[in-house]
């Protein structure tokens, strides 16, 4: 295989040898080992796991394995002063209180240090007032409430169901609406699949189960006290009042048993339509306040959590490249969990562990990759992607010059139906070619390729005979590498057949019931889906690190740029009068995309024909491929989001989990009809078209012949 030529290794040490070394039984064993106690960021238990992983990666054969520590802002409940929500009567007596903890799952009753459900980084406070039900607390839900229903959330406590969008966006929206507190709950409509039992008898969420999670709006900043710079020993830290992304109102999560008690008394307006109704036996009235008999009762929140600067530890392993040691392919996933981390993150960490073991086995037999592979076990992902972001901030100069690709490795499964891939268009062909070579683990696809089962179960909406590959959003550790630094990135996992519930997660997400047994009994008893994900993630890393010519196809970027330009033009044309009045032209953008397409096509022709035995020319062509993603970075960043610098992709301003294309133009156009100064608003649209067109043209020119 050509990918072996430059490293002078025996033919058996190819991709097949690497893949054959991966074993489902090992992944299972590692998952068990990583999930027996909680590994909350900033705790001694998670530090001990970091040291264990360091030791084992060294044993597996990596050249070096180091801990990289940072002192970052984390958030914990007060151990002696628990958080809860009450219904109070007119005398102020608490007539109902929400539960203080989740009932522990069987076998875990005596485990200590299970953090009770809380919303990380909630400020302290004891607000009381009338309740307003705000559906998913999305931008459009508040538009419906405020504009159509004329319901004012100012001074109210809002209750929102989890799902559809990142919880931090819900809190931000509630704050902007003037709410003084937020209650988040899991509705069975979103977290209880019909026909499946609750844990421990199935994979559904029981009524006492609660989703933990941070509620920050960091927009890529990392540690809230040291935006842009590593939280090291000599860091200058902002005061808490100047910290990035902290919520300003108390927030607390509850399960659906407790939610029932709050929602069943709701009065006021009826839900506007059926999309506001969940599956509880309650009216889903919007409020404000309780119905007739209970109208004098109020809701009171009791939040006493504290923000604390705490030490976190990343584990960074290095397998030095034989030919291009100054080119880095990174495989990273987090280690910290909310409780046991049965799926998130340890189903991913176990896969990384097995990938490291396989690479180490090959290295012990005399093999080395062409390029350096870095392996990372990130800390404090659950608290805002802190470990990965601080490390990238500390190493940004190296990464921007040497970073070839980043492959993310959080949860390996969120279901067991089919593959799900989000990545840069540069990796489309790599993913297609790799999955054609891997066996499908799916029932009914014995002897068929992963590509075939994936394409059948998750077809591309645009191209027949191809699988769906999604845009990268955020909410995971690739964010700093892709959105800030412009390093080609991708992620892969097994997912559910639940397209309408795309961003709600699996039912037991971030609950105490996310255990080893959940995975072993209900999701993947044979660990065959984990093995497939290991093959995809590991195979991508292998090819990226070992192929002589980088496995990036710039023509696929041209195709999507055209699609995204068409889409944003169509959105803008929904305002034809303003387009005409303010002379808004997309000509420059379409021209730039046309030029990109032509230059990418010519580059691809040269890539087929050049002399691969000439190391200087080879390096030159590879550098053009490596730096293409970097060329989409605007050093000034997006408006009000300086750490989101990619002009083609950014996390949606309305849902951190989702990716938006041409985000600068999209945000400038969003709700433009409501802007008080239309001339200024359309001026910003024109500016964003200019920035996008310039960036696409500039990126195209990086692919031109160098002289």
């Amino acid at each position: 295989k050509s990918s072996n030529e430059a490293t002078n290794i025996t033919p058996k040490h190819n991709m097949k040898a690497f893949l054959d070394e991966l074993k489902a039984e090992n992944i299972k064993k590692f998952l068990y080992n990583f999930t027996q106690i909680p590994h909350l960021a900033g705790t001694e238990q998670n530090f001990q796991l970091a040291k264990q992983i360091q030791s084992q990666w060294k044993e597996f054969g990596l050249d070096s394995v180091e801990l990289a520590h940072y002192d970052v802002l984390l958030s914990y409940p007060n151990k002696t002063h628990p958080n809860y929500i009450s219904i109070i009567n007119e005398d102020g007596n608490e007539i109902f209180n929400t539960s203080l903890f989740e009932p522990p799952p069987p076998g875990y009753e005596n485990v200590s240090d299970i953090v009770p459900p809380f919303s990380a980084f909630s400020p302290q406070g004891m607000p009381e007032g009338d309740l307003v039900y705000v559906n998913y607390a999305r931008t459009e839900d508040f538009f419906k409430l405020e504009r159509d229903m004329k319901i004012n959330c100012s001074g109210k406590i809002v209750i929102a169901r989890y799902g559809k969008v990142f919880r931090g966006n819900k809190v931000k929206n509630a704050q902007l609406a003037g709410a003084k507190g937020v209650i988040l709950y899991s509705d069975p409509a979103d977290y209880f699949a019909p026909g499946v039992k609750s844990y421990p008898d199935g994979w559904n969420l029981p009524g006492g189960g609660v989703q933990r999670g941070n509620i920050l709006n960091l927009n890529g900043a990392g540690d809230p006290l040291t935006p842009g710079y590593p939280a090291n020993e000599y860091a200058y830290r902002r005061g808490i009042a100047e910290a990035v992304g902290l919520p300003s109102i108390p927030v607390h999560p509850i399960g659906y048993y407790d939610a029932q008690k709050l929602l069943e008394k709701m009065g006021g307006s009826a839900p506007p339509d059926s999309s506001w109704r969940g599956s509880l036996k309650v009216p889903y009235n919007v409020g404000p306040g309780f119905t007739g008999n209970f109208s004098t009762q109020k809701v009171k929140m009791h939040i006493h959590s504290t923000n604390e600067v705490t030490r976190i530890y990343n584990v960074i392993g290095t397998l030095r490249g034989a030919v291009e040691p100054d080119r880095y392919v990174i495989l990273g996933g987090h280690r910290d969990s909310w409780v046991f981390g049965g799926i998130d993150p340890q189903s991913g960490a176990a896969v990384v562990h097995e990938i490291v073991r396989s690479f180490g086995t090959l290295k012990k037999e005399g093999w080395r990759p062409r390029r350096t592979i870095l392996f990372a076990s990130w800390d404090a992902e659950e608290f805002g992607l802190l470990g990965s972001t601080e490390w990238a901030e500390e190493n940004s100069r190296l990464l921007q010059e040497r970073g070839v690709a980043y492959i993310n490795a959080d949860s390996s499964i969120e279901g067991n139906y089919t593959l799900r891939v989000d990545c840069t268009p540069l990796m489309y062909s790599l993913v297609h070619n790799l999955t054609k070579e891997l066996k499908s683990p799916d029932e009914g696809f014995e002897g068929k390729s992963l590509y075939e089962s994936w394409t059948k179960k998750s077809p591309s909406p645009e191209f027949s005979g191809m699988p769906r590959i999604s845009k990268l959003g955020s909410g995971n550790d690739f964010e700093v590498f892709f959105q800030r630094l412009g390093i080609a990135s991708g992620r892969a996992r097994y997912t559910k057949n639940w397209e309408t519930n795309k961003f709600s997660g699996y039912p037991l997400y971030h609950s105490v019931y996310e255990t080893y047994e959940l995975v072993e009994k209900f999701y993947d008893p044979m660990f065959k889906y984990h093995l497939t994900v290991a093959q995809v993630r590991g195979g991508m890393v292998f090819e990226l690190a070992n192929s002589i010519v980088l496995p990036f196809d710039c023509r696929d970027y041209a195709v999507v740029l055209r699609k995204y330009a068409d889409k944003i033009y169509s959105i803008s044309m929904k305002h034809p009068q303003e387009m005409k009045t303010y002379s808004v032209s997309f000509d420059s953008l379409f021209s730039a995309v046309k030029n990109f397409t032509e230059i990418a096509s010519k580059f691809s022709e040269r890539l087929q024909d050049f002399d691969k035995s000439n190391p200087i020319v080879l390096r030159m062509m590879n550098d053009q491929l490596m730096f293409l993603e970097r060329a989409f970075i605007d050093p000034l960043g997006l408006p009000d989001r300086p750490f989101y610098r990619h002009v083609i992709y950014a996390p949606s301003s309305h849902n951190k989990y989702a990716g938006e294309s041409f985000p600068g133009i999209y945000d400038a156009l969003f709700d433009i009809e409501s802007k008080v100064d239309p001339s200024k608003a359309w001026g910003e649209v024109k500016r964003q078209i200019y920035v996008a067109a310039f960036t696409v043209q500039a990126a195209a020119e990086t692919l031109s012949e160098v002289a």
């Epitope: 645009e462 055209r562 699609k563 330009a565 068409d566 889409k567 033009y569 169509s570 803008s572 044309m573 034809p576 387009m579 005409k580 002379s583 808004v584 032209s585 997309f586 000509d587 379409f590 021209s591 995309v593 046309k594």
Partner: nanobody, 113 residues
Framework: EVQLLESGGGLVQPGGSLRLSCAAS????????LSWVRQAPGKGLEWVSS????????DYADAVKGRFTISRDNSKNTLYLQMNSLRVEDTAVYYC??????WGQGTLVTVSS
């Protein structure tokens, strides 16, 4: 010089059909998304539909969804709008638009019994 020339308008009864065409010249036709926009008598401009480089990427205003079909023939540098089940409220001058600033002269569609 960019030129967009619409044709195919006329008088039609409610429930009838028309097919509008827009012949384009002076630019690389296949490189641009295109739109139809209309203006009813005494009203402002209203977006109708847009199409990307091929017939797979299309978008419609709610008022016309299911009745109108936008398409293009890149080999003929022509944009089309097939209008079925026409209603009185579809009466308007229909414009072909490239990139937001280049507009045709328009073709009048009158739906009346």
């Amino acid at each position: 010089e960019v030129q967009l020339l619409e044709s195919g308008g006329g008088l039609v009864q409610p429930g009838g059909s028309l097919r509008l065409s827009c012949a384009a010249s002076g630019f690389s036709f296949s490189s641009y998304a295109l739109s139809w926009v209309r203006q009813a008598p005494g009203k402002g401009l209203e977006w109708v539909s847009s199409i990307g480089e091929n017939n797979a990427t299309t978008d419609y205003a709610d008022a016309v969804k299911g009745r109108f079909t936008i398409s293009r023939d890149n080999s003929k540098n022509t944009l089309y709008l097939q209008m079925n089940s026409l209603r009185v409220e579809d009466t308007a001058v229909y414009y072909c638009v490239k990139d937001g600033v280049h507009w045709g002269q328009g073709t009048l569609v009158t739906v009346s019994s």
